[in-house]
Interface confidence: medium
């Protein structure tokens, strides 16, 4: 007979768990991608922007040596949730321009949400403690003018595209470690 | 738009040195990890060298240990390559990298360094 | 001798379909990500796939990748005359701490 009804379900593989996230991780990877790349064409980019209110990148060819699995799903998920704000900030403060990019950003918030549901749950199921952000969260103020919303989405969506794809290569690497 | 554009190559004799750079523009060269990736005349592309956003770590291929050193300078946005004990096998094009994972998105279009006496 | 393992040519004729294998082991392709470039003559070499099966935007969709256990493969269907170039496998070695390149495959479209 099974577990009696109620009761708490037993973990599953963490591999498996962490295999989900990876898929997820990457899909939302070719999102961005593909997202910042429709921004590059609508809105092309003089030069590199960045905003101060974005996290710092965690990861780099000198840290995957090093990595531990409590660690990185800490992390990504405080820094992910950090982008989550700015893709809401986003949409609501972007103004008329940013408005035809709407769908999309609609729909990367949702995977976005999915996927921080879906850490939430390995971390859980991992036991380890649901961290809160280090930093105190900065309130995002309005763009100060519609340029300076496009120059917020480049930031945003370069920034989210790059914290995934050490994303993916940092659980792909700890899944080996399992 | 993302710009890698490599220079300093040339011919130099065995066991002599060079400095190759690589200047980049169009990205926030500081958030990113960069590689050199080598090309002997009519063969395959062969890894040389990795250094971290940040410049702290530096990882090289067997075949340049000792001899190379990767470095970079953030606040210029550029990548150098210090080659010294050069030899006859380390003539190529060289190309600079830039990396946001795993993978090499954009690349230089190269630079040709000669070994010859 | 390439860590990675490619045919050195394959070949098709326009509108075929072609697969480049690329085999390795558990401390490469085994435990990460596996990547393909294209390399035209005489130009630099440029992602085409990356993940396994992810590809960049305007890479056309006849590319796309593979993987399973230690070895990955590059299929390109509807094969077209500019397809003619050198492909490469890369990963990143975790015995080596470095990338490990496949030593490339001459793609002739006949």
């Known amino acids: 007979p099974g577990p009696p009804a109620g009761s708490p379900r037993v973990s599953s593989d963490p591999r498996a768990d962490l295999d989900s996230a990876v898929l997820l991780t990457r899909s939302l990877l070719a999102d961005t991608r593909q997202l910042a790349a429709q921004m590059r064409d609508k809105f092309p980019a003089d030069g590199d922007h960045s905003l101060d209110s974005l996290p710092t990148l965690a990861m780099s060819a000198g840290t995957l040596g090093s990595l531990q699995l409590p660690g990185v799903l800490t992390r990504l998920r405080v820094d992910l949730m950090s982008y989550l704000r700015h893709v809401q900030w986003l949409r609501r403060a972007g103004g008329p321009s940013l408005k035809t990019l709407e769908p999309e950003l609609g729909a990367l918030q949702a995977r976005l949400e999915r996927l921080l549901r879906r850490l939430q749950l390995l971390m859980s199921r991992l036991a380890l403690p649901q961290a809160a952000p280090d930093q105190p969260v900065i309130p995002l103020g309005p763009p100060a003018s519609a340029w300076g919303s496009i120059r917020a989405a480049h930031a945003i969506l370069g920034g989210l595209h790059l914290t995934l794809d050490w994303a993916v290569r940092g659980l792909l690497l700890l899944k080996t470690r399992l | 738009q993302v710009q890698l554009v490599e220079s300093g190559g040339g011919v130099v004799q065995p066991g002599r040195s060079l400095r190759l750079s690589c200047a980049a523009s169009?990205?926030?060269?500081?958030?990113?990890?960069m590689h050199w990736v080598r090309q002997a005349p009519g063969k395959g592309l062969e890894w040389v060298a990795v250094?971290?956003?940040?410049?702290?770590?530096?990882f090289y291929a067997d075949s340049v240990k000792g001899r190379f050193t990767i470095s970079r300078d953030n606040s210029k946005n550029t990548l150098y390559l210090q080659m010294n004990s050069l030899r006859a096998e380390d003539t190529a094009v060289y190309y600079c990298?830039?990396?946001?994972?795993?993978?090499?998105?954009?690349w230089g279009q190269g630079t040709l360094v000669t070994v010859s006496s | 001798q390439s860590v990675l393992t490619q045919p050195p040519s394959a070949s098709g004729t326009p509108g075929q379909r072609v697969t480049i294998s690329c085999s390795g082991s558990s401390s490469n392709i085994g435990s990460n990500a596996v990547n393909w470039y294209q390399q035209l003559p005489g130009t630099a070499p440029k992602l085409l796939i990356y993940y396994d099966d992810l590809r960049p935007s305007g890479v056309p969709d006849r590319f796309s990748g593979s993987k399973s256990g230690t070895s990955a493969s590059l299929a390109i269907s509807g094969l077209r005359s500019e397809d003619e170039a050198d492909y490469y496998c890369a990963a990143w070695d975790d015995s080596l701490s470095g990338v490990v390149f496949g030593g490339g495959t001459k793609l002739t479209v006949l």
């Open positions: 169009g990205f926030t060269f500081s958030h990113y990890d």
């Open positions: 250094i971290s956003y940040e410049g702290s770590n530096k």
């Open positions: 990298a830039r990396t946001p994972g795993s993978h090499f998105d954009y």
